[in-house]
């Protein structure tokens, strides 16, 4: 969470003096150009400055750095490296900042580095190794523990060759780095599916957000390892159905709070196990606002409501009478 | 630290009324469901009720013998949970507990209060 | 309402030998694979801790000589080797349904 300080708290630099020091070593804690300061807060904020790169000099006492708003393109590898480091940053948000790539090693260097947002970039190109440094079978652990990546999915006509679920999931699961990850969003990314393995490699999950996709089914997904889950955000996707599989799952994380609204629920003989569930699980919140979308005859149904005999599916004709 | 804290027992004549009250600290309160256990003198744990979280809109179970006779609330902005108690029978005579519900309530209470004695005698 | 019913009533015991405490429900308690049967130990003077939740995980911060098992209607709770600090009364709980029950208890007590 980000410390609140009363503006007239921050200090600005005035381009004439950035210049003015520029063949000089930076003094010590200086404010960088565009940006303003608060020691008292450790607080940096260069917002909305269509800064092109991360500025050079940094004071040593930052905790809590934005760099929202600007039009950095790429974050190359150590961008946030310095001599000395700056070991105090703790919270960096890249939000909005027009950024396309992230390579490899972006945020090397940043030994306190716990929350990191990139939100609202369109990442066509995420390194594999952006969040671990190096291209190692293990990496050494990652600080992060609150990774935040909604909406990072960039226009279609930028995005490459491949998937880009698996791009993200490239850079999640490298070198096991962030085994220590509490808290990861990943709403808005119109992913289709979440690859089968990202979780189980993700053990100390306290928060997932997955709301705002396009997930269809999570018959292959297993929250079974997830057993510090405290947060499963799956409102306004695709889903058609839960299975008992996932049911069971769910149900037997010892923390677990998990958010539903909005799914196009197709209330036929499929939706039975889900309705007996719902009816009598603690752990979906709003369950009796969840509706059925489909079929046509079952729209806007509340799901708490039905019974075995709405649940239906109509019989599948054998070929010699179906009709084109 | 999770700490709960409960007050307001006393003495009461049989069909008086009594509030208690449970102070919550170290969690955020809204997300839990929070409940009252009663323990009668030298006897067993009884569940009295609970209320639910924000995300299940605060709605209440009760156990048939204090139903239509005591209420379970709860102040969010103070983190607070009251059980207030109307109609009040000797038989009601106990240590009554606050206690929080682990994330998935079907996991039942993790976190208990010391208690309060409630004493309904003439 | 689910009956549990708790034995032995009391169970004298003598430190560093094992100690069982069995609990046994009307009705499966049993929901989508998990048993929601908790075990709760109150010592004198002091209020219910949890020991053993969902039939067979242990509560962080409870020592590992205590384990559940069990699933569906009989449970029973184990300490491999009783310590001093382990005496009070101990109660199984079910949360599989509405209202949530207790069994009676069984006293924990030195020999």
């Known amino acids: 969470s980000s410390p609140t300080s009363s503006a007239s708290s921050f200090s600005s630099s005035a381009p004439f003096l950035a210049s003015a020091v520029s063949a000089q070593p930076p003094l010590p804690d200086q404010c960088p150009a565009l940006c303003e300061c608060s020691e008292a807060a450790r607080t940096v904020k260069c917002v909305n400055r269509n800064l092109t790169e991360v500025p050079t000099d940094l004071p040593a006492y930052v905790r809590n750095l934005f760099l929202t708003g600007n039009q950095l393109a790429v974050l190359p590898a150590g961008a946030f490296a310095r001599r000395p480091p700056l070991a105090e940053l703790a919270a960096l948000n890249l939000s909005g900042s027009r950024l396309d790539e992230v390579r490899a090693g972006a945020f090397e260097h940043l030994p306190s580095l716990r929350q990191l947002d990139l939100s609202h970039n369109p990442l066509a190109d995420l390194s594999p190794f952006a969040f671990s440094g190096s291209n190692a079978s293990v990496s050494a652990p990652s600080p992060l523990v609150e990774l935040i990546l909604n909406h990072i999915v960039p226009p279609e006509d930028e995005r490459q060759n491949r998937s880009f679920e698996g791009m993200v999931v490239a850079a999640l699961l490298a070198g096991r780095a962030l085994q220590g990850l509490r808290r990861l969003e990943l709403a808005s990314n119109h992913f289709l599916y979440l690859p089968r393995d990202v979780l189980a490699q993700l053990p100390s999950l306290r928060h997932l957000d997955l709301s705002n996709n396009s997930l269809v089914s999570l018959t292959y997904v297993s929250f079974r390892n997830l057993t510090h889950l405290e947060s499963l955000h799956l409102e306004d996707n695709a889903l058609k159905v839960l299975h008992n599989g996932t049911l069971a799952e769910l149900q037997g994380l010892p923390h677990i709070r998990v958010f539903l609204d909005n799914n196009p629920w197709v209330c036929d003989c499929h939706m039975a196990d889900m309705v007996t569930w719902l009816k009598e699980t603690e752990v979906v919140q709003g369950k009796d606002r969840l509706t059925c979308a489909y079929p046509e005859k079952m729209r806007n149904r509340v799901l708490l409501e039905l019974n075995s005999a709405d649940l239906d599916c109509d019989p599948i004709l054998p070929p010699s009478l179906q009709t084109s | 630290e999770v700490q709960l804290v409960e007050s307001g027992g006393g003495l009461v004549q049989p069909g008086g009324s009594l509030r208690l009250s449970c102070a919550a600290s170290?969690?955020?309160?809204?997300?839990?469901?929070m409940s009252w256990v009663r323990q009668a003198p030298g006897k067993g744990l009884e569940w009295v009720g609970f209320?639910?979280?924000?995300?299940?809109?605060?709605?209440?179970e009760n156990s048939a013998s204090v139903k239509g006779r005591f209420t379970i609330s709860r102040d969010n902005s103070k983190s607070s949970l009251y059980l207030q108690m109307n109609s009040l029978k000797t038989e009601d005579t106990a240590v009554y507990y606050c206690a929080r519900y682990r994330g998935n309530p079907h996991y039942a209470m993790d976190y208990w209060g010391q208690g309060t004695l409630v004493t309904v005698s003439s | 309402d689910i009956v549990l019913t708790q034995s032995p009533l009391s169970l004298p015991v003598t430190p560093g030998e094992p100690a069982s405490i069995s609990c046994r429900a009307s009705e499966s308690v049993e929901f989508y694979g998990t048993s929601f049967l908790q075990w709760y130990l109150q010592k004198p003077g002091q209020s219910p801790q949890l020991l053993i939740y969902g039939a067979s995980n242990v509560e962080s911060g409870v020592p590992d000589r205590f384990s559940g098992s069990g699933s569906g209607t009989d449970f029973t709770l184990k300490i491999s080797r009783v310590e001093a600090e382990d005496i009070g009364v101990y109660f199984c709980q079910q949360s599989r349904k509405v209202p949530s029950t207790f069994g009676g208890g069984t006293k924990v007590e030195i020999k």
């Open positions: 209320i639910r979280n924000k995300g299940n809109g605060y709605t209440t």
């Open positions: 170290g969690f955020t309160f809204t997300d839990y469901y």
